[in-house]
């Protein structure tokens, strides 16, 4: 459906508040550097334009596509070249090669300095004073940390983040209502963020054919009654929501989230039986709500799928007319039946099936080739299984802090030239799959596990796409996006490796580290961890325990003391001296 | 399991030295901190030292420091406790106790395993 003027139909479509805010969230993922009061102008510029399309759409430049016109918009900052070095040559790009560019400069650690949440007073009196700008800013933050956020679900955030202070500044202990919310938002937040990367990057890196089978599986598990056809549309249209989304073309992607969530409430019937009380809120919480909602009930008596996928005779001749659709057909009727197994593990099932019936089909006799195909599957299931048994197993012996430690010994050992920031980071969100996952029935544990880490193993291959510093690393990333989990768990110790040069000032302390959050004292105790393992990658997993149990009893001992910065300088240095003499540092 | 037991301690005169052993057998040794502690009649059961899983970092309580050492023997299994200049006030029970996997390295919860105790008398 051809619009004279592309803007204006989404404006229109939008709504005001919404145009403003998707614009703000594009310009503030791309252009991640730029002060606040520079969006706002620009996109204060963009929305008065885009009115004046509404009121004529032949007026000048409403033909323009919302990349020229964006991209024009952002290639108008002074600053471009001083703040963004190289990505100011890609204004001197045509459509669509700018935009591309845009994207290639996304970055996803940017040096930006932490949010720091000021008192609960100061936040009332600013949401009190100026909402909009309030709300704004929340948006601006979140958008330039997080430069593939998903951009309606964003919106859904700050709707949430406002009703928060609307409700909490009013309360009569504002902290104690305010607070967990806010915690609550951020660490969902984070979550989502990191879920949508993986999404981005399985469409940027592997393709609309592998995010299109993710989606496939993943749909079949959540609405197993419905028709393949049903899954298929729902499938073609979440990738088209996607692929625009992780392109950039926010209100495009916004507007057809929104016609999505719509279609699905008017199909439920033929969708899923759980979906009726999503259907009731309005479009943001509606459209979370959906993406969110349980599998529905599996349908009763299903027949076996060897019927169609081995016994028949027809096998090769239905795969020969349409490889892709009949690959689909297998992952849909697999995954239905199967909302035990990962996504991931689904997925691997249907790439073993079509190997195998690439190479039967060719064969002289392709039935007596593929016959034994599913029992190729079983080590498939069992190796996941496995692995979620003992390390769940491991983290209720352990809890969750000891077993991240355990893991950032495990993938320090395996992958020491990544820097110690993104050890930290994806250790301890890998060792967070425990109070995750554990919890569950042996039915659930899967899913939930290994999905999840899919999603924490991307955060390490983005962040280290960035800086490659582990040939290691590259190749389980970029090999196959399903076997990412599989291929790092079967690392062994990197025998390459050259012990880190020791440097006393890693292992300096100073008494800040007593007024620190329980969380950022473990980091910091996870830091040292780190670094000693990349001095010493031979020490045995008791003697890193002891050495830390010795830090423990050091920080304690300093913390507790009068003059604590003398207590940390002196018994740091014995401290470190200690730990060299054990472990010939 | 593993058991602790100690020995070397009695009755001594202000001022005199006392040497306390410790032998543990069980789960490896040199894999745990160990720790002493006091139990004075009607008190609180009191931190006194902390020797590291080598031996080459041990922490005091401030009413001992200067006055006691802890040592060990990782071959022999043993954490020793030297007790100089003894005071009166030293009178108590020492255990020694083998550190658990959390808890603070300076209280009696975060020790796992512990000896029978040996009674340690100082008299004026």
């Known amino acids: 459906d051809a619009h004279k003027s592309e803007v204006a139909h989404r404006f229109k479509d939008l709504g005001e508040e919404n145009f403003k805010a998707l614009v703000l969230i594009a310009f503030a993922q791309y252009l991640q550097q730029c002060p606040f009061e520079d969006h706002v102008k620009l996109v204060n510029e963009v929305t008065e334009f885009a009115k004046t399309c509404v009121a004529d759409e032949s007026a000048e430049n409403c033909d323009k596509s919302l990349h020229t016109l964006f991209g024009d918009k952002l290639c108008t900052v002074a600053t471009l070249r001083e703040t963004y070095g190289e990505m100011a040559d890609c204004c001197a790009k045509q459509e669509p090669e700018r935009n591309e560019c845009f994207l290639q400069h996304k970055d996803d650690n940017p040096n930006l300095p932490r949010l720091v949440r000021p008192e609960v007073d100061v936040m009332c009196t600013a949401f009190h004073d100026n909402e909009e700008t309030f709300l704004k800013k929340y948006l601006y933050e979140i958008a330039r940390r997080h430069p593939y956020f998903y951009a309606p679900e964003l919106l859904f955030f700050a709707k949430r983040y406002k009703a928060a202070f609307t409700e909490c500044c009013q309360a009569a202990d504002k902290a104690a209502c305010l607070l967990p919310k806010l915690d609550e938002l951020r660490d969902e937040g984070k979550a989502s963020s990191a879920k949508q990367r993986l999404k981005c990057a399985s469409l940027q890196k592997f393709g609309e054919r592998a995010f299109k089978a993710w989606a496939v599986a993943r749909l079949s598990q959540r609405f197993p009654k419905a028709e393949f056809a049903e899954v298929s549309k729902l499938v073609t249209d979440l990738t088209k929501v996607h692929t625009e989304c992780c392109h950039g073309d926010l209100l495009e992607c916004a507007d057809d989230r929104a016609d999505l969530a719509k279609y699905i409430c008017e199909n439920q019937d033929s969708i899923s039986s759980k979906l009726k009380e999503c259907c009731e809120k309005p479009l943001l919480e509606k459209s979370h709500c959906i993406a969110e909602v349980e599998n529905d009930e599996m349908p009763a008596d299903l027949p076996s799928l060897a019927a169609d996928f081995v016994e028949s005779k027809d096998v090769c001749k239905n795969y020969a007319e349409a490889k892709d659709v009949f690959l689909g057909m297998f992952l849909y009727e697999y995954a239905r039946r199967h909302p035990d197994y990962s996504v991931v593990l689904l997925l691997r099932l249907a790439k073993t099936y079509e190997t195998t019936l690439e190479k039967c089909c060719a064969a002289a006799d392709p039935h007596e080739c593929y016959a034994k195909v599913f029992d190729e599957f079983k080590p498939l299931v069992e190796e996941p299984q496995n692995l979620i048994k003992q390390n769940c197993e491991l983290f209720e012996q352990l809890g969750e802090y000891k077993f991240q430690n355990a893991l950032l010994v495990r993938y320090t050992k395996k992958v020491p030239q990544v820097s110690t920031p993104t050890l930290v980071e994806v250790s301890r969100n890998l060792g967070k799959v425990g109070s995750k996952c554990c919890k569950h029935p042996e039915a659930k544990r899967m899913p939930c596990a290994e999905d999840y880490l899919s999603v924490v193993l991307n955060q390490l291959c983005v962040l280290h796409e960035k800086t490659p510093v582990s040939d290691r690393v590259t190749k389980c990333c970029t090999e196959s996006l399903v076997n990412r989990r599989p291929c790092f768990s079967a690392l062994e110790v990197d025998e390459t490796y050259v012990p880190k040069e020791f440097n006393a000032e890693t292992f300096t302390f100073h008494a800040d580290i007593c007024t620190l959050s329980e969380k950022e004292r473990q980091i910091k105790k996870q830091t040292a961890l780190v670094e000693l393992v990349k001095h010493k990658p031979k020490a045995t997993k008791e003697q890193l325990k002891a050495v830390m149990d010795d830090f423990a009893a050091f920080v304690e001992k300093c913390c507790k003391a009068d003059d604590k910065e003398t207590c940390f300088a002196e018994e740091g240095k014995k401290l470190v001296a200690a730990s060299q003499a054990a472990l010939g540092l | 399991q593993v058991q602790l037991v100690e020995s070397g301690g009695g009755l001594v005169q202000a001022g005199d030295s006392l040497r306390l052993s410790c032998a543990a057998s069980g789960r490896t040794f040199s894999d745990y901190a160990m720790g002493w502690f006091r139990q004075a009649p009607g008190k609180e059961l009191e931190f006194v030292a902390r020797i590291n899983w080598s031996g080459t970092l041990t922490y005091y309580a401030d009413s001992v420091k200067g006055r006691f050492t802890g040592s060990r023997d990782n071959a022999k299994n043993t954490v020793y406790l030297q007790m100089n200049s003894l005071k009166p006030e030293d009178t108590a029970v020492y255990y020694c106790?083998?550190?658990?996997?959390?808890?603070?390295?300076?209280?009696?919860?975060?020790?796992?395993?512990w000896g029978q105790g040996t009674q340690v008398t100082v008299s004026s």
């Open positions: 106790a083998q550190r658990g996997d959390s808890g603070s390295n300076y209280d009696p919860s975060g020790y796992r395993y």
